[in-house]
Interface confidence: low
């Protein structure tokens, strides 16, 4: 059994993740990760689902967050900025947009890097799954520590 | 004795830091921090060695981030983009990279100024040590709050 | 009685709110946030002042966050960068600056969008409060998610 | 303990193979640019090939179309198959990493300052 599992006791145990980005040959625009390189999956009360969610298993307050690096030219792009969303789908009920990020595209030739960080506390009901959705997946950089995702309890 | 010390128990304090950027006349990429300003160290559990790196003395999850505020000019600068990495030394292992940003250069003239977050939840272990490397480190701001670095033990 | 209370127990209480950004009419630098939407407000150790302002009741260390993304255009801006600062005032003190980010306008027309993420570990008297200043408020986005403030109890 | 391994040299004749592997311990070696360089006696070091830890790859001139690096993941592994090997290709050959090679990580480079960690090396000799 992982070792962070009973650091704070049965009735609380630590639960934390940090998942990795993956190039997806899929057109989705939600991003996909893995549990690769120096990932953090606490225990069994927060799993990465199909690769695209976080999925915890109790209800209480998470400090979630997502880092996205993408690369982009103004020219070679749509005009509207690029945007990365943190969602959240709970049991029951719709998605719902928890935070957004948008950086115009850059001028630079082929294209410009930017980085965009995400975060912030929200309530989770037990079966909630948060995942990174973003407008042109094709920009994302996938080099060693440059997208991540990730949450921690409270 | 610090007052965070003991707000958790002999057994599990809270262990944070959060030190403030300083100038260097060093020519090293690694970005020098000290404890000045409102900076937090919550106790002994986490010390700043050589103003360059976090250490820790207890295993376990931690929150680690950084900001860096900088100020660069696409035609003064090198093709290649700013980067700011947050890299893990542990004890008789390689240094790695844990989290990345990639900034392009500014257009602006002299140069235009861009910050850079970084955040996540990692292991480490006791003895290891987290430092902050920059591709280059005479474009970093370091006016009050600009640049900083810190974790928090979950 | 709020179900987050009683999480950690009597003696330590659960303490983080997250706000969401609200626009204003008024001329101030100061950014207005409101209880609305997928916030949190965990119980009353921390509240929402004025609209402007989160303010603690118990002492100790806070990990403190801002994210404003904004809209702007070189020509139409002044030459300064656009800058978010996360700033303390303590009872009877003067306020401080904890931290700042600092972007510079975008080329983009009629506005390039920028966000800007702010976080930190900080020790917060009873009766500390923390605010968010901008250059120019009228260039911040207020959609959904795009701008929000929070901190979380450690 | 971080150590690189090498193995596979010997002697071969002209227009042989031989498989060079590189061995990583004390580390996940999927995650680092990992570089083949070479060293002929009385000669400077030279990069030979490398590979990124996102699996792209680059060659010297000199044995474009002749050698092949890959990397096996599962075995902590990275292979140098060299091809119509040559006399002028007998040196001792060094795999060598650093935790920050590439661009994004999807390129490396074959020049010997890059890098920071070095095999003891295995030896190639190309003689009839």
């Known amino acids: 059994e992982n070792s962070f599992e009973m650091q704070k006791g049965d009735q609380n145990p630590q639960i934390a993740a940090h998942v990795i980005s993956e190039a997806s040959s899929k057109t989705t625009s939600v991003l996909q990760w893995a549990e690769k390189g120096y990932y953090t999956m606490s225990n069994n009360l927060v799993t990465l689902e199909n690769g695209k969610q976080l999925t915890v298993k109790r209800q209480g307050l998470y400090y979630i967050y997502a880092q996205v690096t993408f690369c982009s030219n103004r020219e070679a792009s749509s005009q509207a900025p690029f945007i990365a969303s943190l969602c959240l789908k709970s049991p029951g009920r719709f998605e719902r947009i928890l935070l957004r990020a948008a950086n115009t595209h850059s001028s630079a030739k082929p294209c410009g890097q930017q980085s965009i960080h995400l975060g912030g506390v929200f309530e989770l009901q037990p079966g909630a799954s948060v995942f990174v959705n973003v407008t042109d997946p094709s920009q994302v950089s996938h080099g060693t520590g440059f997208t991540s995702f990730g949450l921690l309890k409270l | 004795e610090n007052s965070f010390e003991m707000q958790k128990g002999d057994q599990n304090p809270q262990i944070a830091a959060h030190v403030i950027s300083e100038a260097s006349s060093k020519t090293t990429s690694v970005l020098q921090w000290a404890e000045k300003g409102y900076y937090t160290m919550s106790n002994n559990l986490v010390t700043l060695e050589n103003g360059k790196q976090l250490t820790v003395k207890r295993q376990g999850l931690y929150y680690i981030y950084a900001q860096v505020t900088f100020c660069s000019n696409r035609e003064a600068s090198s093709q290649a983009p700013f980067i700011a990495s947050l890299c893990l030394k542990s004890p008789g292992r390689f240094e790695r990279i844990l989290l990345r940003a990639a900034n392009t250069h500014s257009s602006a003239k002299p140069c235009g100024q861009q910050s850079i977050h970084l955040g996540g939840v990692f292991e480490l272990q006791p003895g290891a040590s987290v430092f902050v490397n920059v591709t280059d480190p005479s474009q970093v701001s370091h006016g009050t709050g600009f640049t900083s670095f810190g974790l928090l033990k979950l | 009685e709020n179900s987050f209370e009683m999480q950690k127990g009597d003696q330590n209480p659960q303490i983080a709110a997250h706000v969401i950004s609200e626009a204003s009419s008024k001329t101030t630098s100061v950014l207005q946030w409101a209880e609305k939407g997928y916030y949190t407000m965990s119980n009353n150790l921390v509240t929402l002042e004025n609209g402007k302002q989160l303010t603690v009741k118990r002492q100790g260390l806070y990990y403190i966050y801002a994210q404003v993304t904004f809209c702007s255009n070189r020509e139409a801006s002044s030459q300064a960068p656009f800058i978010a600062s996360l700033c303390l005032k303590s009872p009877g003190r003067f306020e401080r600056i904890l931290l700042r980010a600092a972007n510079t306008h975008s080329s983009a027309k009629p506005c390039g969008q920028q966000s800007i993420h702010l976080g930190g570990v900080f020790e917060l008297q009873p009766g500390a409060s923390v605010f968010v200043n901008v250059t120019d408020p009228s260039q911040v986005s207020h959609g959904t998610g795009f701008t929000s403030f929070g901190l979380l109890k450690l | 303990e971080v150590q690189l391994v090498e193995s596979g040299g010997g002697l071969v004749q002209p227009g042989g193979s031989l498989r060079l592997s590189c061995a990583a311990s004390?580390?996940?070696?999927?995650?680092?640019?990992i570089g083949w360089f070479r060293q002929a006696p009385g000669k400077e070091r030279e990069g030979v090939s490398c590979i990124s830890s996102e699996g792209s790859t680059s060659y010297t001139d000199s044995v474009k179309g002749r050698f092949t690096i890959s990397r096996d993941n599962a075995k902590n592994t990275v292979y140098l198959q060299m091809n119509s090997l040559k006399p002028e290709d007998t040196a001792v050959y060094y795999c060598?990493?650093?935790?920050?090679?590439?661009?994004?990580?999807?390129?490396?480079?074959?020049?010997?300052?890059?890098?920071?960690?070095w095999g003891q090396g295995t030896l190639v000799t190309v003689s009839s």
């Open positions: 004390g580390f996940t070696l999927e995650y680092y640019a």
């Open positions: 060598a990493t650093d935790p920050d090679r590439g661009f994004l990580g999807s390129s490396c480079d074959t020049q010997s300052h890059q890098y920071d960690f």
